[in-house]
Structure formats: structure tokens, C-alpha cells
């Protein structure tokens, strides 16, 4: 004959433990039912009555089988630099993640506790390592022959254009400006000479770096935040 199935509450056999989704109540000295996710123990079991479970109240939850007297509190509302990727329900906590242009500076088990704006590389610096959900942008100074003229968290250093004749040499924060050696038509006095790039950017003439924008000293990566560009904001 099969062993009789015990219904909760029941006293465990000496040396045995309670079954799955049951717990041992120290006061009743009985195996009793746990409460399912979305519920909590409203009344703990006795020798004659099983656990009475009740639904979690608003703004509280239980994600796991439990025998807790109160549900866990959902985290506070997402801040302005976050988006709610999972709402607070009776069975799950609210999850807040960082909005685009921000990264998680202080994470928690799920979601993010503290978001920070992605660093923007100022002119003369380009992105060495892009930002991720959990790491900031790393900037590097543009190497000779490359430049970045933007304040950006995504732009990398780009090669200077190659000129037959250089009107203005490029530097770390500005592209080279080319001039035409034999203009096909005469220009009106004061006309703007448009750049005349040579077919590819694969080679470059060595520009003369300006010390203020392309320092010759070497930098160790990752760099700390580069000073913000004039008029730049954190967003």
C-alpha cells in the first residue's frame, strides 16, 4: 500500500524534514504550507490549522515562496534619469534602468540604484571606449593626424583629410583645410576656398599639433573626466 499523503499541518517524522513548499513552524512544531509569490502569511499555522495566506498590498510584493508576515516593499519610483522597465506588481519589484545617454553608476540586483550621465569627450578628444549600461565613456586625446571637433559621448577621432596643398593644417580639434594649386576658375576677392580633398584619407600629412589642444604628453587610459567643453551640459 502506498504511504498516506500527509496534509498540512502535520508533525514530521523524527529525523525527517518538511516537503517542498512547506516550512517547519517552531511554535506549532508542525510542517505547514508556504505562501505562493504575490502572497504572504497573514496567520501562521497552529497544530490544527494551516498557514493563512493573503495577497500583497499595493506597492508590496513577494517574488518567491515564503512565510513572511509582510510582503516586501517595492522600490521607490524611478527618478527622472531612469525609465521603469518593470512595474511594481504583487509578484515582482519595480525595475528602473538608466535612460539613453546615461549609465548605471551604482547597480542593484535588478536594475539601477544610481544613474550618471555619459561623459562627453570635448574637442581634441575622441571616444576610446564607448559607454555601456554599466560603464562610462572613456576619452582619449586625438593622435597626430586625427581630430574631433565635437563635444560628444559617441564620436571617435577621425583622420584629417589629405590635401594636395594645405591651406590650414589640421590639429587635434580641427580638420585640415585644403587649397587648390591651380584653380579652374578665378575666385572673387574674399571668396571662401572650399576644401579639395584628395581621394582617400588613408594617408596624411603630419600636422603641427597646437600644444593647447593636442598635448604631446602621453595619457594613460582610462582617463578621468575631461573638463567640460565651453557651454556644454551634462545631458
Amino acid at each position: 500500500l502506498p504511504a498516506q499523503v500527509a496534509f498540512t499541518p502535520y508533525a514530521p517524522e523524527p529525523g525527517s524534514t518538511c516537503r517542498l513548499r512547506e516550512y517547519y513552524d517552531q511554535t506549532a512544531q508542525m510542517c505547514c504550507s508556504k505562501c505562493s509569490p504575490g502572497q504572504h502569511a497573514k496567520v501562521f499555522c497552529t497544530k490544527t490549522s494551516d498557514t493563512v495566506c493573503d495577497s500583497c498590498e499595493d506597492s508590496t510584493y513577494t517574488q518567491l515562496w515564503n512565510w513572511v508576515p509582510e510582503c516586501l516593499s517595492c522600490g521607490s519610483r524611478c527618478s527622472s534619469d531612469q525609465v521603469e522597465t518593470q512595474a511594481c506588481t504583487r509578484e515582482q519589484n519595480r525595475i528602473c534602468t538608466c535612460r539613453p545617454g546615461w549609465y548605471c553608476a551604482l547597480s542593484k540586483q535588478e536594475g539601477c540604484r544610481l544613474c550618471a550621465p555619459l561623459r562627453k569627450c570635448r574637442p581634441g578628444f575622441g571616444v576610446a571606449r564607448p559607454g555601456t549600461e554599466t560603464s562610462d565613456v572613456v576619452c582619449k586625446p586625438c593622435a597626430p593626424g586625427t581630430f574631433s571637433n565635437t563635444t560628444s559621448s559617441t564620436d571617435i577621432c577621425r583622420p584629417h583629410q589629405i590635401c594636395n596643398v594645405v591651406a590650414i593644417p589640421g590639429n587635434a580639434s580641427m580638420d585640415a583645410v585644403c587649397t587648390s594649386t591651380s584653380p579652374t576658375r578665378s575666385m572673387a576677392p574674399g571668396a571662401v576656398h572650399l576644401p579639395q580633398p584628395v581621394s582617400t584619407r588613408s594617408q596624411h600629412t603630419q600636422p603641427t599639433p597646437e600644444p593647447s589642444t593636442a598635448p604631446s604628453t602621453s595619457f594613460l587610459l582610462p582617463m578621468g573626466p575631461s573638463p567640460p567643453a565651453e557651454g556644454s551640459t551634462g545631458d
Epitope: 513577494t62 515562496w65 512565510w67 509582510e70
Partner: antibody
Framework: QSLEESGGDLVQPGASLTLTCTAS?????????MCWVRQAPGKGLELIAC?????????WYGSWAKGRFTISKSTNLNTVTLQMTSLTAADTATYFC????????????????????WGPGTLVTVSS | DIVMTQTPASVEAAVGGTVTIKCQAS???????LSWYQQKPGQRPKLLIY???TLASGVPSRFKGSGSGTEFTLTISDLECADAATYYC?????????????FGGGTEVVVK
Amino acid sequence: QSLEESGGDLVQPGASLTLTCTASGFSVNVNSYMCWVRQAPGKGLELIACIDTGSGGSTWYGSWAKGRFTISKSTNLNTVTLQMTSLTAADTATYFCARARNTYGYGDYVYGGAFDPWGPGTLVTVSS
Amino acid sequence: DIVMTQTPASVEAAVGGTVTIKCQASQSISSTYLSWYQQKPGQRPKLLIYQASTLASGVPSRFKGSGSGTEFTLTISDLECADAATYYCQGGYFSDNGCYNAFGGGTEVVVK
């Protein structure tokens, strides 16, 4: 129902020591929540580690105690032990074992509160 | 983690007087998880109150526990010489990644 600790001793810094908590009048091996608490001379109570001796068998450690302290149960001896390694003078204390009167559980995590009974304690002195 | 902060660290009162000990949790906790203990010099701690306000067996009604959230109080009225001891609160809470449990730093009660 009573508890008694043993194994306290005078040891050198860097040594290891195992403390034992023996229960009388109840079984620590099934469905008990047993904890070790220490008290340095003239100081307050500090919770070290707990073990749920029921089906979950889950353990809990104070954040400062992880790594050097290990709590376990001995099924046939009706005891709970605390293994301590790399002892320093800061570990000099009276070590108590206690049983939680109430337990509450969330998933695999168990909280034990209302410690009763307590053992009389065993003194561990770490000195060269 | 959780930090349980007790105030005052020490208090002196006369026989027959009343003493109030506060215990503040660094995080809101269920009153179910709050206990109080009494410890006399050279002795093991003794459970006084559990679930914030329920008296343990044999504890006189002069001891009263109250509070909720982050603020809990132990009140001892009609002080007796035998009440001279250090009192500790204990509390904790659950989160999705664990369970936290700690004692307060203790409050010494001196009876004049």
C-alpha cells in the same frame, strides 16, 4: 531545552579553532535555526552565523564573518559547530550559541529572531 | 546590511522610576522581526520581548515594547534593582538578495 558551548581556548594569532554547540531536550538536526553570537570583553553582541537545519539547510553569515567562519551541523551528534580560521586578537570574545524561537522564510533565505535558549558561552582568547 | 542604533548608551534611574530605550533601524523593518534582550554581567542574554511587543515567558509586565518601521522602544517602569543590566535590540529584514540581521549596540541601565 538547553544549549552548551565547548571548544573555547587560548590560541596564537593565525590559528584555527572549532567551537561546538550541543543541544539537550531537542534535536538541532531537524527544523531548527541555530546561530552563533559573540561578545568581546566589555562590548556588545555580534551575530556571526546561523544555519537552518531543516530541509533547506541554508546558512547565513554576518558580512564581516564571510570567509573565516563556517557554520555546520553534525547530524549524529546533535551539535552545531563553528569553524574559525586566521584568528586575530580582535576575535577574542565569549562565543554563545542560540536557537531562534521564530523563523520566517523568503525563498531560500531564512530569518531567525527571538533567540531562546542561549548557551552559557565559551571563551576564546587569541594572544601570543 | 542593516544597522540597529540604540540610544542612550547608558541611562541611570532610581528604583520605582521609568526608563525608555530607543532602537532605530537603518531600514524600515516589520515589527515581527524585532526582539529585545536583557544581559546581566557574566551571564548569557535573556529574551525579553519578541515581535516588538510580545513578552517572553516569565517576563513581568513592567517591560513594554512598542514601535514600528524604523523606530522601536523598550520601556521599563517601576524599576527594580534586578533590572540593572544591558539591554539589546535585534532586528532584520528580507530583500530579494538576502536576509539581514543585527543587534543594536546595547544600553546599560543603572539603578540607583
